[in-house]
């Protein structure tokens, strides 16, 4: 025997209180598949979330994050504060990367500069808060009398951020 509810299309629900007839989803709710016994409440994009797509009777609202925040999680279920390149987010806010560490993203954490000497290379371009060092040829490969213009980067150990 076919379930009488199966004929209720998306955007409606099978109303048990009305002899299982198909009733439209009430305002601020939706059903995305046929045969639903109830409509789901629409997601509300509040606070640091902003509406990317309005809720309709057949599909949920979609949110993203307000400027200055980035999405995490499925369907942008979380928003985390952005920082600038050269910074990382702590509970006290955005803090500059400590010397010897960098972050080239607006999110995430600082990580240590590459230690060129571990690969037998020299530092071609110094690291900054925003950029890793650039390693060049090994000191032995340089022409006689020439030397690396910059001191080697510190060993690639975890940085210690102000917290």
């Amino acid at each position: 025997l076919q379930d009488p509810c199966s004929k209720c299309p998306a955007g409606t629900f099978c109303d048990n209180n009305r002899n299982q007839i198909c009733s439209p989803c009430p305002p601020n709710s939706f059903s995305s598949t046929s045969g639903q016994k109830a409509c789901d409440i629409c997601r509300q994009c509040k606070g640091v979330f902003r509406t990317r797509k309005e809720c309709s009777s057949t599909s949920n609202a979609e949110c993203d994050c307000t400027p200055g925040f980035h999405c995490l999680g499925a369907g942008c279920s979380m928003c985390e504060q952005d920082c600038k390149q050269g910074q990382e987010l702590t509970k006290k806010g955005c803090k500059d990367c400590c010397f010897g560490t960098f972050n080239d993203q607006k999110r995430g954490i600082c990580r240590p500069w590459t230690n060129c000497s571990l690969d037998g290379k020299s530092v071609l371009v110094n690291g900054t808060k925003e950029r890793d060092v650039v390693c060049g040829p090994s000191p032995a490969d340089l022409s006689p009398g020439a030397s690396s213009v910059t001191p080697p980067a510190p060993a690639r150990e975890p940085g210690h951020s102000p917290q």
């Epitope: 995490l72 985390e80 995430g108 990580r111 975890p158 210690h160």
Partner: antibody, heavy 116, light 109 residues
């Protein structure tokens, strides 16, 4: 959509080596940290370490330093966890997760059984 | 490294409030996150950055964090909330993440 797909269950003998994988898709794999988390049978979650696939910088929990190696191949969006010599006490479920503090996506887990 | 301590188990009657604590030296100085894990499943974030609730997580879940204790509160606990709960924090000293030992929440009845 974002997914982390891990390699299948493994049954190994003590002393054998093993490398398990975690393939990311649906996002910029190179620019998000990947962490590995161990869960021994009936026990809690233990953070093992993390890798930044963009430059393969790794950082380990003191408890796991020297016990495992974490690596990544950004060209195929895959992170790895490996052992050179397994012990019975390595029997556990191993999860990869995206992130370093907030783990917003998790793999389905790889069950590793080490038994003679 | 910071150590996070949770009670091994908490029991609550349906509809009542469950509180799960997570204690660690000055944890209030760092963000605390909470994960729910049901049998055979990967963990899921239920609270992030002390008190923020991801969309899709019911409003009955809330969090706080100050001093030496972070707390996950579930108001009007339901049978489906029965699971293991883990707190975690990222510490900038040592560059590491730490999980608490986990708390098994049992919903009575």
């Amino acid at each position: 959509q974002v997914q982390l797909v891990q390699s299948g269950a493994e049954v190994k003998k003590p002393g054998e080596s093993l490398k398990i994988s975690c393939k990311g898709s649906g996002y910029s794999f190179s620019t998000y940290w990947i962490s590995w988390v161990r869960q021994m049978p009936g026990k809690g979650l233990e953070w093992m370490g993390k890798i930044y696939p963009g430059d393969s910088y790794t950082n380990y929990s003191p408890s796991f330093q020297g016990q495992v190696t974490i690596s990544a191949d950004k060209s195929i969006s895959t992170a790895y966890l490996q052992w050179s010599s397994l012990k019975a006490s390595d029997t556990a479920m191993y999860y990869c997760a995206r992130g370093y503090g907030i783990f917003d996506y998790w793999g389905q887990g790889t069950l590793v059984t080490v038994s003679s | 490294d910071i150590e996070l301590t949770q009670p091994p188990s908490v029991s609550v009657a349906p509809g009542q409030t469950a509180r799960i604590s997570c204690s660690g030296d000055n944890i209030g100085d760092q963000y605390a996150h909470w994960y729910q894990q049901k049998p055979g499943q990967a963990p899921v974030v239920v609270i992030y950055q002390d008190k923020n609730r991801p969309s899709g997580i019911p409003e009955r879940f809330s969090g706080s964090n100050s001093g030496n204790t972070a707390t996950l509160t579930i108001s009007g606990t339901q049978a489906e909330d029965e699971a293991d709960y883990y707190c975690s924090t990222y510490t900038f000293v040592g560059f590491t993440t730490v999980f608490g030992g986990g708390t098994k929440l049992t919903v009575l009845g």
